[in-house]
Amino acid sequence: QPPPPPPDATCHQVRSFFQRLQPGLKWVPETPVPGSDLQVCLPKGPTCCSRKMEEKYQLTARLNMEQLLQSASMELKFLIIQNAAVFQEAFEIVVRHAKNYTNAMFKNNYPSLTPQAFEFVGEFFTDVSLYILGSDINVDDMVNELFDSLFPVIYTQLMNPGLPDSALDINECLRGARRDLKVFGNFPKLIMTQVSKSLQVTRIFLQALNLGIEVINTTDHLKFSKDCGRMLTRMWYCSYCQGLMMVKPCGGYCNVVMQGCMAGVVEIDKYWREYILSLEELVNGMYRIYDMENVLLGLFSTIHDSIQYVQKNAGKLTTTIGKLCAHSQQRQYRSAYYPEDLFIDKKVLKVAHVEHEETLSSRRRELIQKLKSFISFYSALPGYICSHSPVAENDTLCWNGQELVERYSQKAARNGMKNQFNLHELKMKGPEPVVSQIIDKLKHINQLLRTMSMPKGRVLDKNLDEEGFESGDCGDDEDECIGGSGDGMIKVKNQLRFLAELAYDLDVDDAPGNSQQATPKDNEISTFHNLGNVHSPLK
């Protein structure tokens, strides 16, 4: 083993370096000293370090480590934060457009129901927005409230426009009759199923993204232990005490130190992997009735169909409700007038397939692909940090924490550390409390994601009994029940091409193309064209 190079006789180099860390040179010895008070950079001979310098090095080493960790996670953090913002805004835009489409449908087809319908539609979509953002609202209650509110207006304005004002105090009775007589057929149930499934998935997707941000933020701001600070000081700064300013730590030694320092953080790895894979599974299932964009943008059509259903049954309904709500005190006897033959043949409920332009769904898949490139983020952290801090290539002529060596040997390094700080002890301490907390949160979200992810093949399951749908409710496949009625089947074209230009856009190069090409098909299925009308104005 070669003898160490002679220390700087005047500690001049050390002084000039330390000046950058700590202005004022009172702690730096003029010439090498025995250094018997040192606790980390234990000297083999005279040293240019003092106890105060050692403390400053430890502080700097821990700060360096925090900065390295933050820069390591910067790209991942940016990816999730931006996507969470993009999707949150995108979902809000979908809700606003769905509300506009529904209002337009009422205005074009049922002008006598506006402005009351606008009010009820507005309240419904406000609840939808709140639900997506985590509010404790029951989706079935939202849908029931919409139909409960609409029916009295439909009854008094469409079915019985000549009702005298004195008869208008029957609203409560009409609200009750709406459910008892199933006046909208199975449409409310259909909408409940679609909306609850799609919104649940949307909500959990946003929750998962926000938790991803929390995970990164937690590990990003970890405070490293004093033990770790000592190890880092020994690796990065103790060589300076011997005047070895240009020497770099051995790569193998860096890996050992980083694994020790990051033992707790690396424990997140297993749950992080599961998080990304579970999120991928959820995203893969987000289509048809599990895709809120698809469901909400087609909702106006289903509501239109439900009103047509009422109109087709107006004769029977008017008679029944006339008896039922003639006097509000008769309300408790509603069930006695329940007509057996009220329901229309379910075969009339035809399906309109939704033309679905790839926008939000392709954006989600793009996010998953990018996230998957970070699947080993936590297990790879020690190596990443070493590769982004100065280390000697090929482990030759490098610093092993005690001296300059020609080749790094982990065994030799361990032997040389016998009297010093023990790496094994550091690993045994277990993760920081904040890391344990974040692991618990990851476990919880992973469980939720697994619960929400549809098993393979479930999305197209033909057996709908568990949903309470009778065969024939809506074609053969509940997942295709997006609406559509007899004559002019209403088709919806996804209008969210603007997503590519959202203010938060991740990277312009990766944004989905904002293709403006309109084929004849585009014109046929423009969203606003057929909001209930079979004739399109732009032909």
């Epitope: 809000e92 506006t114 904002n514 423009s526 009308n533």
Partner: antibody
Framework: QVQLQQWGAGLLKPSETLSLTCAVY????????WSWIRQPPGKGLEWIGE???????NYNPSLKSRVTISVDTSKNQFSLKLSSVTAADTAVYYC??????????WGQGTLVTVSS | SYVLTQPPSVSVAPGKTARITCGGD??????VHWYQQKPGQAPVLVVY???DRPSGIPERFSGSNSGNTATLTISRVEAGDEADYYC???????????FGGGTKLTVL
């Protein structure tokens, strides 16, 4: 293809009532709203109001007190009346088919001049 | 009431791309429609629902809408595109039609 043909008096004195009619040819009348829009010389478009086949109207608040839009479904026509006109009402008046939320087809326009 | 703001004029060389903006509070939440008006003629709908074209309108006309700005883009501009362009929204909260002030497109 739907066509909108409009006509009415082109020269009015202040305080008189502007009266225009628009006839709809070659398309459904009942499925849409029908609108009036005006454009003062060298200026932008201003929405006046709308009506549907059942007579349901909706007006621009700034003109509401002076505007009446009516419909005659038997003739597939709708009309605009604007009372107490002043020089500020000088404009080209357009009728249009309004398929909420846009105006898909327009009449040729009628220049109405208010001058004493 | 809802207000739409357009630049009074935009100039562009033939063959280049013209972009006409329409600003409004959270306009991205609304459907935006664009009309072209040539001197002495009635307006013609060129883009509806942010980005769709009626039949007969060239593919050179496209639209986008996000945040507080909607944009009408005319690529490979021709002399015949010189006209006034108006944006329009339906403000469903007031149930009124609202127009922007218009933008004069000059082809240099």
């Amino acid at each position: 293809q739907v066509q909108l043909q409009q006509w009415g008096a082109g020269l009015l004195k202040p305080s008189e009532t502007l009266s225009l009619t628009c006839a709809v040819y070659g398309g459904s009348f009942s499925g849409y709203y029908w609108s009036w829009i005006r454009q003062p010389p060298g200026k932008g478009l201003e929405w006046i109001g709308e009506i549907n086949h059942s007579g349901s109207t909706n007006y621009n608040p700034s003109l509401k007190s002076r505007v009446t839009i009516s419909v005659d479904t038997s003739k597939n026509q709708f009309s605009l009346k604007l009372s107490s006109v002043t020089a500020a009402d000088t404009a080209v008046y357009y009728c249009a088919r309004y398929y909420v939320p846009y105006l898909s087809d327009w009449g040729q326009g009628t220049l109405v001049t208010v001058s004493s | 009431s809802y207000v739409l703001t357009q630049p009074p004029s935009v100039s562009v060389a033939p063959g280049k791309t013209a972009r006409i903006t329409c600003g409004g509070d959270n306009i991205g939440y609304k459907g935006v429609h664009w009309y072209q008006q040539k001197p002495g003629q009635a307006p013609v709908l060129v883009v509806y629902d942010d980005s769709d074209r009626p039949s007969g309108i060239p593919e050179r006309f496209s639209g986008s809408n996000s945040g507080n700005t909607a944009t009408l883009t005319i690529s490979r501009v021709e002399a015949g595109d010189e006209a006034d362009y108006y944006c329009q929204v339906w403000d469903s909260s007031s149930d009124h039609v609202v127009f922007g002030g218009g933008t004069k497109l000059t082809v240099l």
